[in-house]
Amino acid sequence: WCLESSQCQDLTTESNLLECIRACKPDLSAETPMFPGNGDEQPLTENPRKYVMGHFRWDRFGRRNSSSSGSSGAGQKREDVSAGEDCGPLPEGGPEPRSDGAKPGPREGKRSYSMEHFRWGKPVGKKRRPVKVYPNGAEDESAEAFPLEFKRELTGQRLREGDGPDGPADDGAGAQADLEHSLLVAAEKKDEGPYRMEHFRWGSPPKDKRYGGFMTSEKSQTPLVTLFKNAIIKNAYKKGE
């Protein structure tokens, strides 16, 4: 799925958005739409919880072999994150030992600070790929295979439950809309439903701090939506010429 690619990992700048849309264009001609089924989206392999601490650019993590193989290698690549320059003071006790057993680099003792001891699941930039869940089995699938926090109103349309991926797949006519929809989902990650923080050591942070200032208000999300729409419209206009 093209959103798994490195071009779509950081959707915070216009150039990155356009790059992502460009990368995803081949998907539009694919035989199967991104969300097959009778109006009910397939479970995404992208999970909100994969955005672990990606916006804290505080450390560099070495690459690690993944157990995934296959043509498009979803989640195979582990992005290196640039070491931050102006980090705040270390919490008491300093960083815990690195999980990979590697010796700390020359800078690590000072300003570069591993966040791995914050037990948020995966380290910075690390993708997580849960197995898809089909709770209703032989009956019509619900959108439950979607993480609960994905069940949200997006562009005026709530994800429908009950039709499910076992329904007839459409023939790809809605692929452009699906692309826009899924890019918006990836870019917005609106805070509805529980923001899972149960194993973070000091519980839930204030709402406006949850994304490190990246998504403090509803207003700040609007430009992203507009940006996507403009980019796609511009793209279609160029094609028309």
Epitope: S66, G121, P130
Partner: antibody, heavy 115, light 110 residues
Framework: EVQLVESGGGLVQPGGSLRLSCAAS?????????ICWVRQAPGKGLEWIGC????????YYASSAKGRFTMSRDNSKNTVYLQMNSLRAEDTAVYYC???????WGQGTLVTVSS | DIQMTQSPSTLSASVGDRVTITCQAS??????LAWYQQKPGKAPKLLIY???KLTSGVPSRFSGSGSGTEFTLTISSLQPDDFATYYC????????????FGGGTKVEIK
């Protein structure tokens, strides 16, 4: 009705190979589902072998299955495969395919590795 | 791969008893845990997913709880049909961690 049916099990000699099939009905494999393989040795617990995302073709394996076992799919036949090479006596088990995390499991096919 | 430790391995109980089975993950798996019931010669049946969500058609006497690394399956009042083997399974991350099963708990008649 949504169903999975395994086939291809049987008696094989140590060092031999076998390809198991998992035929899906009631849903279209190419739409992009996780189909997973799980085995159960006689009198033992369940052991996860791996999953294939039938949409992308991406495969994910248990550490113990890497190297000898390969999953693939044929969308035209609505079927997923498990190729098993260099089989050993300890691979003797009932092999199940399952649709992700669900109650949709095949009936299982017995693989016996013995000389 | 993540290790899933299930206990007890065998549990003797009577009809009407409250039964509790625990499952511990070797690292945090959030709520990505499923519970299955298996009877001899049959394929497993999904009871609970997302640690606490009951699959449709499963009696409400079954319940699941927990998150992070500690999980529990509870049968509030054991019925004759519940004598079986129960397995937990994580599905948190198949890229790095696999979808490991616990060792199983056989619930037998006392």
């Amino acid at each position: 009705e949504v169903q999975l049916v395994e086939s291809g099990g049987g008696l094989v000699q140590p060092g031999g190979s076998l390809r198991l099939s998992c035929a899906a009905s009631g849903f279209t494999v190419s739409s992009g589902y996780d189909i997973c393989w799980v085995r159960q040795a006689p009198g033992k617990g369940l052991e996860w072998i791996g999953c294939i995302d039938t949409g992308s073709g991406n495969t994910y394996y248990a550490s113990s299955a890497k190297g000898r076992f390969t999953m693939s799919r044929d969308n035209s036949k609505n079927t997923v495969y498990l190729q098993m090479n260099s089989l050993r006596a300890e691979d003797t088990a009932v092999y199940y395919c399952a649709k992700g995390i669900s109650s949709i499991w095949g009936q299982g096919t017995l693989v016996t590795v013995s000389s | 791969d993540i290790q899933m430790t299930q206990s007890p391995s065998t549990l003797s109980a009577s009809v009407g008893d409250r039964v509790t089975i625990t499952c511990q993950a070797s690292q945090t798996i959030s709520s990505d845990l499923a519970w299955y019931q298996q009877k001899p010669g049959k394929a497993p049946k999904l009871l609970i997913y997302a640690a606490s969500k009951l699959t449709s058609g499963v009696p409400s006497r079954f319940s699941g709880s927990g998150s992070g690394t500690e999980f529990t399956l509870t049968i509030s009042s054991l019925q004759p049909d519940d004598f079986a083997t129960y397995y937990c399974q994580t599905y948190y991350d198949i890229i790095d961690d696999g979808a490991t099963f616990g060792g199983g708990t056989k619930v037998e008649i006392k």
